[in-house]
């Protein structure tokens, strides 16, 4: 394989490394209150936390990035914590013809990794 | 659509926003000199730069993240610049039976977005 094994234990202490966290947001927060009717409030799972060397590396590229960041921190950024997968969410919204239910596949994170 | 249109012009000035940049790396830099034979040096395209509000948003989730970061910067991180696609690269490496050519699909970034 082109890469060392990604680490899954956080060397920075509990809750500091890349993980999924729930953020409460209203339609007003999202600027959606003019077209989304429901839900009024969303429990949004988001990816937060740091990406220390080789922690939850998304792929070979992320591992290279981590290594080069160690060598050239001013030139190469550290990997960062982003969604690895998403959970579909259904929104009820206004349409020209009335009200519609629509599924959005890329709205709520289900898992995170360092990319 | 669940989201505003992502921005493609950088409000921070030229070269400051999320973009593809070439980084030169040797096999020694990558720690691969013991098993990769060729190329001796790699031109690695990596994603660097900032992700200001709605710049090159990867998807709806990234746009929500940008918006909530504006409202709760301590709780929600800004989107960050990561690969949207990769370019395959062929490496020549040692194997138990000799030398092999192998394609790696996730080694060099081809495009970037804010996730």
């Amino acid at each position: 394989s082109a890469h060392a094994h990604p680490r899954d234990s956080c060397p920075l202490g509990p809750g500091r490394c890349c993980h999924l966290e729930t953020v409460q947001a209203t339609l007003e927060d999202l600027g959606w209150s003019d077209w989304v009717l429901s839900p009024r409030q969303l429990q949004l799972s988001m990816c937060v936390g740091e990406c220390p060397h080789l922690y939850r590396s998304a792929n070979t590229h992320a591992q290279i990035k981590a290594r080069l960041h160690g060598l050239q921190p001013d030139k190469v950024p550290a990997p960062c914590c982003v969604p690895s997968s998403y959970t579909p969410v259904v929104l009820m919204h206004r349409t020209d013809s009335g009200v519609s239910l629509q599924t959005y596949d890329d709205l709520v994170a289900r898992g995170c990794h360092c990319a | 659509s669940a989201h505003a249109h992502p921005r493609d012009s950088c409000p921070l000035g030229p070269g400051r926003c999320c973009h593809l940049e070439t980084v030169q790396a040797t096999l020694e830099d990558l720690g691969w000199s013991d098993w990769v034979l060729s190329p001796r040096q790699l031109q690695l395209s990596m994603c660097v730069g900032e992700c200001p509000h709605l710049y090159r948003s990867a998807n709806t989730h990234a746009q929500i993240k940008a918006r909530l970061h504006g409202l709760q910067p301590d709780k929600v991180p800004a989107p960050c610049c990561v690969p949207s696609s990769y370019t395959p690269v062929v490496l020549m490496h040692r194997t138990d039976s000799g030398v092999s050519l192998q394609t790696y699909d996730d080694l060099v970034a081809r495009g970037c977005h804010c996730a």
Epitope: R40, L42, V90, R94, V99 | -
Partner: antibody, heavy 121, light 107 residues
Framework: QVQLVQSGAEVKKPGASVKVSCKAS????????ISWVRQAPGQGLEWMGW????????FYAQKLQGRVTMTTDTSTSTAYMELRSLRSDDTAVYYC??????????????WGQGTLVTVSS | DIQMTQSPSSVSASVGDRVTITCRAS??????LAWYQQKPGKAPKLLIY???SLQSGVPSRFSGSGSGTDFTLTISSLQPEDFATYYC?????????FGGGTKVEIK
């Protein structure tokens, strides 16, 4: 605890109208929608439509369009369903149901006890 | 409109039996499916939502599975209070539609 209490049974003549009420308690009324479902004797469940208790936007089932009106009174946390031009095949038990909606989707998590509407000449 | 087809329409079973009810959607509905139990003269009661999430207060012998077009409600060990009619419901798109129901009867 969440409760939905509906108005009592009604007997109506064909061509008349009926208005069924559904009083909610135990939660913030405007946070969730209300759906109406009916069940003819010995039959299955038929969804009639939905109303947002927050915006009063509605969606009505096609077959009832033009005959049904759903409304809410947020001051009393009450939802209403009016059905006009009643026919004998409108004879059914009418239920209101809180329509919970979050990132796990929609579901009817609390129901009223039902209101029997009999249409007979 | 999305049609929901339940099978069987009725099933005879004994206390302690494992009972499986299936529900098929006429088009893909992701995991946007709920299951309800109804006893004679009573309002329906929510058992399962989002295809497999157990509603609070519902016994763990009830479970749901499936996604897309094919779904299953399983009662792992039938209890006397489980004899009732069960309905599936799609909440993927308007109009919301119910299956025709499955009556679980005492053998």
């Amino acid at each position: 605890q969440v409760q939905l209490v509906q108005s009592g049974a009604e007997v109506k003549k064909p061509g008349a109208s009926v208005k069924v009420s559904c009083k909610a308690s135990g939660y913030t009324f405007t946070n969730e929608g209300i759906s109406w479902v009916r069940q003819a004797p010995g039959q299955g469940l038929e969804w009639m439509g939905w109303i947002s208790a927050y915006t009063a936007d509605t969606f009505y089932a096609q077959k009832l369009q033009g005959r049904v009106t759903m409304t809410t009174d947020t001051s009393t946390s009450t939802a209403y369903m009016e059905l006009r031009s009643l026919r004998s095949d409108d004879t059914a038990v009418y239920y209101c149901a809180r329509t919970r909606h979050d990132t796990s989707g929609l579901r009817f998590d609390y129901w009223g006890q039902g209101t029997l509407v009999t249409v007979s000449s | 409109d999305i049609q929901m087809t339940q099978s069987p329409s009725s099933v005879s079973a004994s206390v302690g039996d494992r009972v499986t009810i299936t529900c098929r959607a006429s088009q893909g509905i992701d995991s946007w499916l709920a299951w309800y139990q109804q006893k004679p003269g009573k309002a329906p009661k929510l058992l399962i939502y989002a295809a497999s999430s157990l509603q609070s207060g519902v016994p763990s012998r009830f479970s749901g599975s499936g996604s897309g077009t094919d779904f299953t409600l399983t009662i792992s060990s039938l209890q006397p209070e489980d004899f009732a009619t069960y309905y599936c419901q799609q909440v993927h798109s308007f109009p919301i539609t119910f299956g025709g129901g499955t009556k679980v009867e005492i053998k």
